[in-house]
Amino acid sequence: VLPRWRQQWSGSGTTSRFPETVLARCVKYTEVHPEMRHVDCQSVWDAFKGAFISKYPCNITEEDYQPLVKLGTQTVPCNKTLLWSRIKDLAHQFTQVQRDMFTLEDMLLGYLADDLTWCGEFNTFEINYQSCPDWRKDCSNNPVSVFWKTVSRRFAETACGVVHVMLNGSRSKIFDKNSTFGSVEVHNLQPEKVQALEAWVIHGGREDSRDLCQDPTIKELESIISKRNIRFFCKNIYRPDKFLQCVKNPEDSSCLSGI
């Protein structure tokens, strides 16, 4: 039997044991989060699979993920949404300590897909473990990119009160309009529900005392937000290590001074 021709993409293939990983993560998540105990993880996997299996992996739409989004519906209390851009690890360390704040990856759908890659093949029920489309080199409408765009949009749309965003002050573009935050989340905050966006600019160098809130890209962010009539605030986090320490132990005497 001749081996069937398989499309070669520029990106790495589906994460090994992808179905098992998604299912296991779902089970773990629903056990830990009582409000999601009603979720049937097999149905979640079926909906996830249905979004990309048998479909051309450069032609995935947000519509393909709607059944999954519906099953994973979750609400974050007002003032408790934390967005991030190019600084995922610190954002996650923060919400692990500050348990009442949530990043997208603290929600079921984000938790399921975090750090995973997946894609299928047109007209077959197989998962492609060899290669998947790269956003830049192949196409933007690939299963992974469309998933994150879809769930990020939804996460931003449902945010309310004061929304926080953690930004990487070590990057040349602290606010990057091409990031998921800059291209999706900012534009989907709902002005009738969101009173303000507060940016936390995380400094990299220990001796960096500059006011990065005056960075031109931050002013650009304020410009975008202001047109939507959402208030904008910005804080420098000069010492991220101390910042996390003070979240853990707010009574610590050293936490009374600036971070």
Epitope: K173, K177, H187, Q190, P191, E192, P216, T217, K219, E220, E222, S223, S226, K227, R228, N229, F232
Partner: antibody
Framework: EVQLLESGGGLVHPGGSLRLSCAAS????????MNWVRQAPGKGLEWVSS????????YYADSVKGRFTISRDNSKNTLYLQMNNLRAEDTAVYYC???????????WGQGTTVTVSS | QSVLTQPPSASGTPGQRVTISCSGS????????VNWYQQLPGTAPKLLIS???QRPSGVPDRFSASKSGTSASLAISGLQSEDEADYYC???????????FGGGTKLTVL
């Protein structure tokens, strides 16, 4: 005193080109998003284009997309509008205006007239 | 055809109160910044109302504005002859990524 001063307008044949300039003074030019707005004779205001603070991002009205290019030189406190392949319907007074956060198009220049006619 | 809809003309006698309406949609007026501009004959537009309802310094308190849903309105009380001008509403439009204007209302003081 906060001021915007446009220049570069004139009479040009259809298909021709013009480059408009807008010199800013009295405020920190590099802190503001900048815009071009035009007004055809006897008509209303029409937004043409805007450019972000850093100049990295530009936006255009559908009517000028692909023909006009907005740019800025923060070191010279100057905004530009390169207009190519001009049409009769581009005839208008062209104003530059800064965008002030939470205010709107705050300060406007006096305008420069562009006439496209054969 | 303007994205925002304004009446082409309005008039009133000195001392009267005149209101100019501006109608839009969710992507502009409802959720975003709305401004009003005054353009006196032969001059550049001037920002009259910023941030939906605020008067920049130097604008008389005879000018006021309101916003409700997808509509906005400008009210001028104690009308004066120097108020004779064109008035434009404008808003940022999310879906177009553009500033959109009303067609303008020519105010005549009789």
């Amino acid at each position: 005193e906060v001021q915007l001063l446009e220049s570069g307008g004139g009479l040009v044949h259809p298909g021709g080109s013009l480059r408009l300039s807008c010199a800013a003074s009295g405020f920190t030019f590099s802190d503001y998003e900048m815009n071009w707005v035009r007004q055809a004779p006897g008509k209303g205001l029409e937004w043409v284009s805007s450019i972000s603070i850093t100049g990295d991002f530009t936006y255009y009205a559908d009517s000028v997309k692909g023909r006009f290019t907005i740019s800025r030189d923060n070191s010279k406190n100057t905004l530009y509008l390169q207009m190519n392949n001009l049409r009769a319907e581009d005839t208008a007074v062209y104003y530059c205006a800064n965008y002030k956060s939470y205010y709107g198009l705050d300060v406007w220049g006096q305008g420069t007239t562009v006439t496209v006619s054969s | 055809q303007s994205v925002l809809t304004q009446p082409p003309s309005a008039s009133g006698t000195p001392g009267q109160r005149v209101t100019i309406s501006c109608s839009g949609s969710n992507s502009n007026i409802r959720y975003n910044l709305v401004n009003w501009y005054q353009q006196l004959p032969g001059t550049a537009p001037k920002l009259l109302i910023s941030n939906n309802v605020q008067r920049p310094s130097g604008v008389p308190d005879r000018f006021s504005a309101s916003k409700s849903g997808t509509s906005a309105s400008l009210a001028i009380s104690g009308l004066q002859s120097e108020d004779e001008a064109d008035y434009y509403c404008a808003a940022w439009d999310d879906s177009l990524n553009a500033w959109v204007f009303g067609g303008g209302t020519k105010l005549t003081v009789l």
